[in-house]
């Protein structure tokens, strides 16, 4: 009995034409939504003039359907038992699951103005840029629609820059009609304990973003894990959104539509400072903003974003140090709402439900040559938005799963 089930599982989780895993892997049967909450700044003038605390009010959710496109350029390599692919990106707005429309306006940090002095630290260049910022009537904050903020808008200041640069700015620009990858993952044919584990990303085994072992691409893409998952196992996965590999640990057992699953959660330890978790030392790549690597809960991913001052955190700075959230008013971190979890069916290793939560922040610093920023007396890591990407196995799929997998085991 058990041996037969094990044999069947091992056969069916291999990523090759004809298996259950492969069919679901090519195009997920789960409907995946990405909800956005935008941090609307309530006191923009006060901040720019007096370097006050930034008062924010979250507005959302604004919901998009994502990950509905099938993987493309799927190529099996029988030599090294891998399969390579790209994951196309697409987002469709879901008005019925949103509090407003894509045309809703928000007051947010001016991304181009904040990034310019960070990218160009040279005084001469900053003086030139300052004249263009003034000419374009840009300031520290701007009003943008949801659509512009997420997917891109032509920036008036950047449009005046007299040398070739991208003049379109957006938190996720470019997104639609782009792909993530190339991913090359083990198909599990020769060794089932390696199935779905990433062998390389964009042709490389390392990211080139971090020093030492922090740069490694570990584990899977979190959609599935090698089968026969034990509670003691640490699930490692790579997330291109946060430009790093991370891990989840067992939290609890849950019943998901009659299927017993293990809920794995991202521990606070994963976001700790090197002081609290020495393993994180190589994720601290700059000393000033991080207060000599004592701050925690924010990750500087600038190296992965062409030098732009982008910081990733958990929503509302959950698990972040007080110095990070102190200059921001209106944040209410909450473990249940703001943590990330994966509900993994332990026999197959399939993730049947998940909630990926993260927050996108931009660092803005005082810049004596940029009039819009010269009254600032301290740096701010400014929350722009947070997102909740969720997926749950459908009722039909769950029934099928119970019949074919868990039912047989019982």
């Amino acid at each position: 009995g058990d041996m037969l089930i094990e044999k069947t599982i091992k056969r069916e989780v291999v990523l090759e034409e004809g298996t259950t895993a492969f069919k679901n892997w090519v195009k997920t049967g789960t409907t995946v939504y990405r909800q956005f909450w935008i941090f609307d700044v309530q006191n923009p003038d006060d901040v720019a003039k007096n370097s006050s605390k930034i008062k924010v009010k979250q507005r959302g959710p604004y919901t998009y359907r994502v990950r509905y496109l099938a993987k493309e350029n799927i190529t099996q390599d029988p030599e090294d038992h891998t399969v390579s692919f790209v994951q196309p990106n697409g987002a469709i707005f879901e008005p019925s699951l949103s509090v407003g429309t894509e045309d809703d306006n928000f007051t947010v940090l001016n991304l181009a103005v904040a990034a310019a002095p960070h990218i160009y630290q040279n005084s001469f260049v900053q003086v030139v840029l300052n004249s263009l910022i003034k000419k374009s009537k840009s300031s520290m904050f701007q009003t943008r629609s949801l659509k512009e903020l997420l997917w891109g808008y032509k920036d008036p200041f950047l449009s005046l820059v007299p040398y070739p640069i991208s003049t379109t700015v957006g938190v996720f620009y470019p997104y639609n009609d782009t792909v993530d990858g190339v991913y090359k993952v083990f198909n599990g044919k020769d060794n089932i304990s390696k199935v779905a584990i990433i062998e390389s990303y964009k042709g490389k085994r390392n990211l080139s973003y971090w020093p030492s072992y922090c740069d490694m691409i570990n584990g899977t893409d979190a959609a599935s894990f090698p089968p026969f998952v034990e509670k003691s196992r640490t699930l490692r996965f790579f997330s291109s959104d946060i430009c790093r590999s991370i891990y989840a640990v067992f939290g609890s057992e849950i019943d998901l539509k009659g299927i017993p699953v293990y809920r794995f959660v991202l521990p606070a330890n994963a976001f700790a400072s090197p002081l609290q978790n020495p393993d994180n030392h190589c994720f601290c790549t700059e000393k000033v903003i991080s207060n000599n690597c004592t701050s925690y809960g924010v990750l500087d991913i600038g190296k992965c974003k062409e030098g732009k001052p982008v910081y990733i955190s958990l929503p509302h700075f959950l698990h972040a140090s007080p110095d990070v959230s102190e200059p921001i008013e209106g944040l209410h971190p909450n473990e249940d709402e703001h943590r990330t979890y994966l509900d993994v069916e332990p026999i197959t290793g399939f993730t049947l439900q998940f909630a990926k939560r993260l927050q996108v922040n931009i660092l803005v610093k005082p810049a004596r040559k940029i009039e819009a920023l010269k009254n600032l007396k301290r740096p701010y890591i400014v929350p722009i938005l947070w997102l909740n990407e969720t997926g749950t196995i459908g009722d039909e799929k769950a029934e099928m799963f119970k019949t074919q997998v868990t039912g047989k085991i019982k």
């Epitope: 040279n122 030139v128 004596r368």
Partner: antibody
Framework: EVQLQQSGPELVKPGASVKISCETS????????MHWVKQSHGKSLEWIGG????????KYNQKFKGKATLTVDKSSSTAYMELRSLTSEDSAVYYC???????????WGQGTLVTVSA | ETTVTQSPASLSMAIGEKVTIRCITS??????MNWYQQKPGEPPKLLIS???TLRPGVPSRFSSSGYGTDFVFTIENLLSEDVADYYC?????????FGGGTKLEIK
């Protein structure tokens, strides 16, 4: 040690052009702005313009637009200034000077004397 | 364009005396003023950069103050080696503009 080595003195005829060079060493050439400054005999200093080698961005003092052209050769870490349609008014010592991020004209070349004479 | 008016054009002081040079700008430049020393036959040398910051290796007898439009450069306890031309430079906006210079001589 940062060094800026300028080309030698030039004696040129009115109406002609001249191109002076400033070879740099001891630093990452592309990361710092190179400026050019004019000093007429016994007079003060005048900023001609600056070039940021990283992306070739240039900015000129309006007074020298059409007179001076700033370029760089990243492969040899050399900055150039061409002066055209020369008149006796252009006779001066020309300096290249380099920034240090937020410090203006932190390092200077030794100067190039340009004499315009028939 | 910000014009910079430097005074005096020349001055003659005795060794050990205190020297004061002034620059006034036509626009508010915060504290974006720099001071340079130029000895005969040499390029200028930066002494003090924006924010009244004394450059490393520059003797502490040199100092500056000022904000907005009025700036003062001071040499306490003048030495013979301080004989030179002194220039101020505003770096708040382009074009960068220098003062007319001050020729400092020893009495």
């Amino acid at each position: 040690e940062v060094q800026l080595q300028q080309s030698g003195p030039e004696l040129v005829k009115p109406g002609a052009s001249v191109k002076i060079s400033c070879e740099t060493s001891g630093h990452t050439f592309t990361e710092y702005t190179m400026h050019w400054v004019k000093q007429s005999h016994g007079k003060s200093l005048e900023w001609i313009g600056g070039i940021y080698p990283n992306n070739g961005a240039t900015k000129y003092n309006q007074k020298f637009k059409g007179k001076a052209t700033l370029t760089v050769d990243k492969s040899s870490s050399t900055a150039y200034m061409e002066l055209r349609s020369l008149t006796s008014e252009d006779s001066a010592v020309y300096y290249c000077a380099r920034d240090r991020y937020d410090v203006w004209f932190a390092y200077w070349g030794q100067g190039t004397l340009v004499t315009v004479s028939a | 364009e910000t014009t910079v008016t430097q005074s005096p054009a020349s001055l003659s002081m005795a060794i050990g005396e205190k020297v004061t040079i002034r620059c006034i700008t036509s626009t508010d430049i915060d504290d974006d003023m720099n001071w340079y020393q130029q000895k005969p036959g040499e390029p200028p040398k930066l002494l003090i950069s924006e924010g009244n910051t004394l450059r490393p290796g520059v003797p502490s007898r040199f100092s500056s103050s000022g904000y907005g439009t009025d700036f003062v450069f001071t040499i306490e306890n003048l030495l013979s080696e301080d004989v030179a031309d002194y220039y101020c430079l505003q770096s708040d906006n382009l074009p960068l503009t220098f003062g007319g210079g001050t020729k400092l001589e020893i009495k």
